[in-house]
């Protein structure tokens, strides 16, 4: 729970948050996600770095891998083979993009207490995983896929055409990693490890983004990434499946693409194994309002994969793009043909549907003016999912269980009343057959992780309650937080307001708007955070507000798809509308209002500053998009269509930050970007700066050499210190 407010007599013993607290991570919290290995066992890395097996039913635990072994290879991660004979140890972690990294892998034999020698793995490896049964290994090295039947065996090479920046096998290229798969891998074992499916991405024709990496050498390096910007040539994707028992027998077999998809540019969006001989692929047209789910079966006679048209399910949006941020993935039931899936109902709310034969005949499982967010697990008799139904707060997440064995199905909220004040935003992690599950509560109080019985939902034990954090916060004057809504012209604008500890409605406070605002995002969430804006409220006496306007998620399609083909309009309008409403509340100093955002938020903050309203005195844009023609095809076209004359070029041109350069004249603008940003290229800020210079508009800027979109490490400290000075100067607050 958030520490309760103390009486004034004790208030002088309490202190405000400092910027140092934030930068040092003094008030960070821990979560506990069990690494499940069966229905009732999980592994966890102890505080002293031993790998410990916990048995829930006996309450006992024992160490399977000592910290000495971990330390001998500097391991930072591990993975137990399903037959429990081997552990891979991961070291020399080297980050690439958001999810991808390379590493060195060692295989440790638990039965012998020694590392497997002979036929060692090459280094560095791009991805490695165990088969779901036994101890086969699949790995990607230099863009090719290899298979080992046993860790000590010589490898079998599955693909041979892998080439840096050209052909990617079993791993995604940049755009698929960031905007479609959201993983570092593009290979999938069948449930019993008989087959291995993988994607091949051909980037040969994709234009390359090139930027300098300055490093320490006399000459900078040039980083080249095949990166399709809006309207550019896209990767060509193919899906193959190989029999891992006899990999050399027929070799990889290509899975056919549905005809209605293959007729024009398309994407592969996900692969879900149903059984060892049935697989489900999802495809998406380049114009992302049509998605096809295709169920394919193995033909033993031909050793090929057959995807009959009768097993194609089409999902189409007439009001926006298909799905939310991504098209949802199916969760198959035990009959291995029917499945549960989240998509929009007739009222425009995302809900769980049960599909047995056709999408048209889908049975709606959940309904209401709220949204189902994630299906965690389907067992023989229960379906566990999360939603924001409870008490009609879109920024909450509770876990529900629907009994699917009985008719009509009964629904129970598992989490709604557990720790009602402390916990309103949950996720869950289930063991095999949902025998047990862990709940991880993210707030609004101090996060807590608990273990539960999957049949009774009874809490078994607390896994992590962040006691040290609770004690550390006892003498801290935390800001107050409130989540409320504004009703404006038939639109509901939810907002979170962070108020100084001694907030007094009769006084006037400077206001900082923190904005993200990207399609299908949500900023107003009931989660715990002690971060930079907490400090600004606690120590510097600012009011901070976050507003979820049009384009944001989990409140229905009307709000979500309002921005379709019109990015940069309504998101900005809604921030401005909210500011006007906040001024009307009477405690905002209307001469001291600022806005800041990062990434999409930098784009929105820039447009808000250049809106000509006179509302904002100053603002900050960190790594902003400045023109949608500069951003990735998969993301941009999903919401904007193509930048062509016969499609949506006009709005691409109208929605740039550069087109509004003149309007920055009457605001103080701080523009910040990392020079090695692989995601939102430095080009975006370079073009803003050029337009401002050409318009003879003064502004402030900061670049971070060799830093990417995250501005991590020492740059983080510099960044927040710099932004703090800028805001304090803007609000005339003494340093």
């Amino acid at each position: 729970l958030r520490p309760s407010r103390v009486h004034n007599s004790e208030e002088n013993t309490m202190r405000a948050l400092t910027l140092k607290d934030i930068l040092n991570g003094t008030f960070s919290y821990k979560t506990f996600f069990p690494n499940w290995i069966s229905g009732q066992e999980y592994l966890h890395q102890s505080a002293d770095n031993n790998i410990v097996l916990y048995n829930i039913e006996t309450g006992q635990s024992y160490t399977i891998l000592s910290n000495r072994t971990m330390k001998s290879v500097n391991a930072s991660n591990y993975g137990l083979s399903p037959d429990r004979q081997f552990v891979y140890l991961e070291s020399d972690y080297s980050k690439l993009w958001r999810y991808s990294y390379t590493a060195t892998y060692y295989i440790y034999d638990l039965s012998n207490g020694e590392f497997v020698r002979g036929n060692e793995l090459p280094r560095p490896i791009q991805y490695l995983c165990w088969s779901p049964v036994g101890s086969k290994l699949a790995y990607v090295y230099q863009n090719n896929i290899y298979l080992k039947q046993r860790p000590g065996d010589p490898p079998f090479q599955i693909t041979f055409n892998g080439r840096e920046n050209k052909i990617f096998n079993g791993i995604p290229d940049w755009v698929y990693e960031e905007e479609m798969l959201a993983t570092k891998y593009a290979l999938w074992w069948s449930p019993n490890g008989k087959f291995l499916a993988y994607a091949e991405f051909n980037d040969t024709d994709i234009p390359v983004i090139a930027y300098s990496y300055y490093g320490d050498e006399q000459y900078p390096r040039t980083i080249n990434i095949p990166y399709p910007k809006a309207g550019a040539k896209n990767p060509v994707v193919r899906i193959f499946i190989i029999d891992t028992t006899y990999p050399a027998y027929v070799g990889p077999q290509e899975v056919p693409v549905p005809a209605m998809i293959a007729s024009s540019d398309y994407y592969f969006s996900w692969l879900t194994w149903v059984t060892d001989e049935r697989v489900c692929l999802q495809w998406l047209k380049r114009v992302q309002n049509v998605s096809v789910l295709s169920i394919c079966d193995f033909r033993e006679d031909w050793q090929t994969w057959d995807c009959p048209k009768t097993q194609e399910h089409i999902e189409e949006s007439r009001t926006g793009w298909a799905g939310g941020f991504f098209v949802s993935t199916p969760v198959f039931s035990y009959d291995a043909i029917s499945y549960y899936k989240i998509f929009s109902d007739k009222d425009g709310y995302k809900h769980i549907h049960y599909i047995k034969d056709t999408v048209e005949n889908a049975i709606q499982i959940t309904s209401g003016k709220w949204e189902a967010i994630n299906i965690f697990r389907v067992t023989q008799d229960s379906l566990f999912y999360s939603s924001n139904e409870f008490e009609e707060y879109p920024g909450r997440r509770n876990i529900y269980r629907i009994s699917i064995g009985s008719y009509p199905p009964s629904k129970k909220c598992v989490t709604c009343h557990l720790r009602k004040e402390r916990c309103q935003y949950y996720t869950a992690s289930f063991s095999d057959y949902a025998k047990y599950y862990a709940l991880v509560c993210y707030g609004p109080g101090i996060p807590i992780s608990t273990l539960h019985d999957g049949r009774t939902d009874q809490e078994i034990k607390i896994l992590e309650e962040n006691k040290e954090l609770e004690n550390a916060l006892k003498n801290i004057q935390l800001p107050k937080e409130e989540i409320k809504k504004l009703e404006v012209d038939e639109i509901t604008l939810w907002y979170k307001m962070i108020l100084p500890p001694q907030f007094d409605r009769s006084k006037k406070y400077p206001l900082l708007i923190q904005v993200y605002g990207g399609p299908c995002s949500q900023s107003v969430r009931s989660v715990f955070a002690v971060n930079w804006i907490s400090y600004l409220a606690s120590k510097e006496g600012m009011v901070i507000a976050l507003v979820d306007g049009r384009g944001t998620a989990f409140q229905g399609d009307k709000l979500l798809y309002a921005v379709y083909r019109k990015l940069g309009v309504y998101e900005v309008e809604d921030q401005i509308t909210a500011v006007r409403k906040f001024i009307e509340m009477g405690f905002i100093d209307e001469k001291r209002i600022a806005i800041w955002g990062w990434s999409y938020g930098g784009y929105v903050s820039s447009l808000a500053l250049a809106s000509g309203t006179g509302l904002f005195k100053c603002g900050i844009a960190v790594a902003p998009v400045s023109s949608w023609e500069y951003y990735a095809s998969v993301y941009t076209e999903r919401f904007m269509g193509l930048p062509t004359k016969d499609d949506n070029l006009e709005h691409y041109k109208n929605s740039t930050v550069m087109a509004r350069a003149e309007y920055f004249r009457n605001v103080d603008y701080l523009l910040i970007h990392g020079t090695a940003d692989d995601n939102v290229h430095f080009q975006n800020s370079a073009q803003i700066a050029k337009a401002l210079v050409n318009a003879q508009v003064d502004f402030q800027a900061m670049w971070y050499s060799d830093q990417n979109h995250g501005l991590s490490g020492l740059s983080t400290n510099h960044l927040y210190t710099h932004m703090t000075h800028f805001l304090k100067q803007c609000f005339s607050l003494s340093d």
Epitope: S38, G39, Q40, T58, T63, I64, S66, T69, L110
Partner: nanobody
């Protein structure tokens, strides 16, 4: 303290059968995943069969269809029924938790299969 006592090994002709037993104390075997392991002369120890705390089992490819792992909950004992024995099954057989703890093994029981 966990104690594991293997027994039932011996000398047997190829094609013959043996039943190994493992008396378990210090833990309830039925509630723990247990395994039989073996180490042949000059070779590394390997998993022969694993039995989950439910009913899930795993067998090494070399013994599939010939060996059966089971337990008697009342006696807190783990068994390995070995049929159609081959000379290459000659080894010291151990029982342990599955996966094994990093620091404990019993004495084992010797199985020798003559041709």
């Amino acid at each position: 303290q966990v104690q594991l006592q293997e027994s039932g090994g011996g000398l047997v002709q190829a094609g013959g059968s043996l039943r190994l037993s493992c008396a378990v104390s210090g833990i309830i075997s039925s509630m723990n995943a247990m395994g039989w392991y073996r180490q042949a002369p000059g070779k590394r120890r390997e998993l022969v069969a694993g039995l989950g705390s439910g009913v899930s089992t795993t067998y090494a490819d070399a013994v599939k269809g010939r060996f059966t792992i089971s337990r008697d909950n009342a006696k807190n004992t783990l068994y390995l029924q070995m049929n159609s024995l081959k000379p290459e099954d000659t080894a010291v057989y151990y029982c342990n938790r599955w996966p094994p703890p990093y620091d404990y093994w019993g004495q084992g029981t010797q199985v020798t299969v003559s041709s």
